[in-house]
């Protein structure tokens, strides 16, 4: 019983939440809250938007982003791409892990020019010590953050 | 090996399924089937729509709801909100954990009067003993329950 | 500590990815890549599109499919069904586990005839040794595979 409890307490897990500072507009990944409210890190590190593995193994990684807008401004892509990407010292470029494409702008109803849509990604990937996972959304201007419950990013070892 | 198997057998987990009685129309949370078919409880309790933690720790909680309709009836909001909420003795009000907003009614095509959409939520949250998690959908009349495979609610300790 | 690490290394898990050969057009389930790139099997087997349990227990199973098209061809159903199904020697027919219905064709915007949508399913189910889980999409012609990051299928024991 002690063994079982210890194994849960040590199992790497994290849940990071959206915040006003999440959208940088710099072309970088989304940034996240790591401590306040529902956010926490247990056996994983955080660095500039990335969850960083401290222990090698398979992790279920997940992210949800809340999308929303009024109509679909011409300057915005009509296709939104939401993805989880791996950064590793072994490759110079980010590696796509899990990706979704949506066309949410067409969801405005005849009644309402405002539309909402949500994109959820989750899957098991292998991470070596020091490897990082980040979230990107293109076009990030359509991401709605608010209170940390609608857009988030997390992981746990399986 | 015995230790490893025991740890799996004792690990809190649950999967609850939609049923005809899930929609109360009372403004309360959705109710769920806990025993029949695919539904089960292992190390978690159930009470009036809520999964109740018997063991403190981090849980991956999830819910999917199937939404459907013909057009978008006037009495229904054009935005549907699907959320997982925590009830705790420490606060008088429910706490938002994971929330999605969708605008599904605009999805009927010229080809089709009937539209379908699905909302999935999942994420890691901390629960103390006795804390509860419930699912709410506004407007719940658009939720399709029926056979238990299209709308469901579950959790497991990570 | 050794015990805990061993338990993770032995915990059944898999992540299978979409490939050019995934869509058979034969009415069968989707087929998957099991070794290349992000795909792996650990303590689970694979057979003709199915993840096969080697160890009885509760598994979190998941699948995402990327859907896309140009308009909505009349020959295609306007409702897309994405589901996870169990095959067991105890029943002659597949058993629905987790299912979603979407109406993605209505998502083309006035800006763009091309639409994209994504369907994610995940939930905890019980599998006996030898029982299989497969993914089906109707109509599978709308599934977009590309590089294995957009459509995938996985599981891990909880």
């Amino acid at each position: 019983l002690i063994q079982e409890r210890r194994s849960h307490q040590n199992n790497p897990a994290a849940h990071l939440t959206g915040a006003n500072s999440s959208l940088t507009g710099s072309g970088g990944p989304l940034l996240w809250e790591t401590q306040l409210g529902l956010a926490f890190l247990r056996g994983l590190d955080y660095h500039d938007g990335a969850l960083v593995a401290n222990k090698a193994g398979y992790y279920y990684i997940y992210s949800k982003v809340q999308l929303g807008g009024v109509g679909c401004p011409l300057g915005l892509a009509s296709t939104i791409t939401h993805g989880l990407y791996k950064r590793t010292p072994r490759y110079p470029e980010e590696l796509e892990l899990l990706v979704s494409q949506q066309s949410p702008c067409g969801r405005a109803t005849s009644n309402s020019r405002v539309w909402w849509d949500s994109s959820f990604l989750g899957g098991v990937v292998h991470l070596e010590v020091g490897e990082e996972v980040v979230v990107r959304v293109l076009d990030e201007r359509l991401v709605r953050l608010r209170d940390g419950t609608r857009s988030y990013f997390g992981a746990f070892m399986v | 090996l015995i230790q490893e198997r025991r740890s799996h057998q004792n690990n809190p987990a649950a999967h609850l399924t939609g049923a005809n009685s899930s929609l109360t129309g009372s403004g309360g949370p959705l109710l769920w089937e806990t025993q029949l078919g695919l539904a089960f409880l292992r190390g978690l309790d159930y009470h009036d729509g809520a999964l109740v933690a018997n063991k403190a720790g981090y849980y991956y909680i999830y819910s999917k709801v199937q939404l459907g309709g013909v057009g978008c009836p006037l009495g229904l909001a054009s935005t549907i909100t699907h959320g997982l909420y925590k009830r705790t003795p420490r606060y008088p009000e429910e706490l938002e954990l994971l929330v999605s907003q969708q605008s599904p009614c605009g999805r009927a095509t010229s080809n089709s009067r009937v539209w379908w959409d699905s909302s999935f939520l999942g994420g890691v949250v901390h629960l103390e003993v006795g804390e509860e998690v419930v699912v709410r959908v506004l407007d719940e009349r658009l939720v399709r329950l029926r056979d238990g495979t299209r709308s469901y609610f579950g959790a497991f300790m990570v | 500590l050794i015990q805990e690490r061993r338990s993770h290394q032995n915990n059944p898990a898999a992540h299978l990815t979409g490939a050019n050969s995934s869509l058979t057009g034969s009415g069968g389930p989707l087929l998957w890549e099991t070794q290349l790139g992000l795909a792996f099997l650990r303590g689970l087997d694979y057979h003709d599109g199915a993840l096969v349990a080697n160890k009885a227990g509760y598994y979190y199973i998941y699948s995402k499919v990327q859907l896309g098209g140009v308009g909505c061809p009349l020959g295609l159903a306007s409702t897309i069904t994405h589901g996870l199904y169990k095959r067991t020697p105890r029943y002659p027919e597949e058993l629905e586990l987790l299912v979603s219905q979407q109406s993605p064709c209505g998502r083309a915007t006035s800006n763009s005839r091309v639409w994209w949508d994504s369907s994610f399913l995940g939930g905890v189910v019980h599998l006996e040794v030898g029982e299989e889980v497969v993914v089906r999409v109707l109509d599978e012609r709308l599934v977009r595979l590309r590089d294995g990051t957009r459509s995938y299928f996985g599981a891990f024991m909880v």
């Epitope: - | 939404l67 309709g69 006037l74 229904l76 009937v114 | -």
Partner: antibody, heavy 121, light 107 residues
Framework: QVQLVESGGGLVKPGGSLRLSCAAS????????MNWIRQAPGKGLEWIAD????????YYADSVKGRFTISRDNAKNSLYLQMNSLRAEDTAVYYC??????????????WGQGTTVTVSS | AIQLTQSPSSLSASVGDRVTIACRAS??????LAWFRQTPGKTPKLLIY???SLESGVPSRFLGSGSGTDFTLTISSLQPEDFAIYYC?????????FGGGTKVEIK
Amino acid sequence: QVQLVESGGGLVKPGGSLRLSCAASGFTFSDYYMNWIRQAPGKGLEWIADISSRDNTIYYADSVKGRFTISRDNAKNSLYLQMNSLRAEDTAVYYCARERGFGDYFGMDVWGQGTTVTVSS
Amino acid sequence: AIQLTQSPSSLSASVGDRVTIACRASQDISSALAWFRQTPGKTPKLLIYDASSLESGVPSRFLGSGSGTDFTLTISSLQPEDFAIYYCQQFNTYPLTFGGGTKVEIK
């Protein structure tokens, strides 16, 4: 109880006009799509028009397009069918029907008793 | 327009018989199909919606099945009030259409 009552039918000459009404009671009228369906003597059922609850989106069968107009007044719990340029083949019993369209419940579950329209010279 | 073809157009059966009526759609309508019963001089009554869902208050001897293009209505044990005309109707696509009807008569 839930009820639909049609009125306004009668005998009319070819080329003439009629306005049918359907009074709803016992339910929240504004939550439902409403349909008009007709049945010629000794024949099957033919859908002719519907109107959405939310934004008054309207569709017609080709056989009546340009001649018939469906409308509703949610404040009065009433559905209407304005029929112009009537032809002999429009002779039928006209039914209004409520259509459910959300979640687990679909279909035209409540029908009126029908009103007879006869087009004859 | 989507055409619904019912078969047979008529059939003779006795009380207690099992009866099956088919409805074929000219293109895929998913599960957006309803079945109605109409007795002479009466309004149509909804029996089944969404291809297989039994309407509240309808006896369980009525069973709907199928999806896509092929649908069936089965009456497991015919009762006297079941001698009537049965219609299928698709509500997936405009214009809404009904099948031509199947008349169930007393043998």
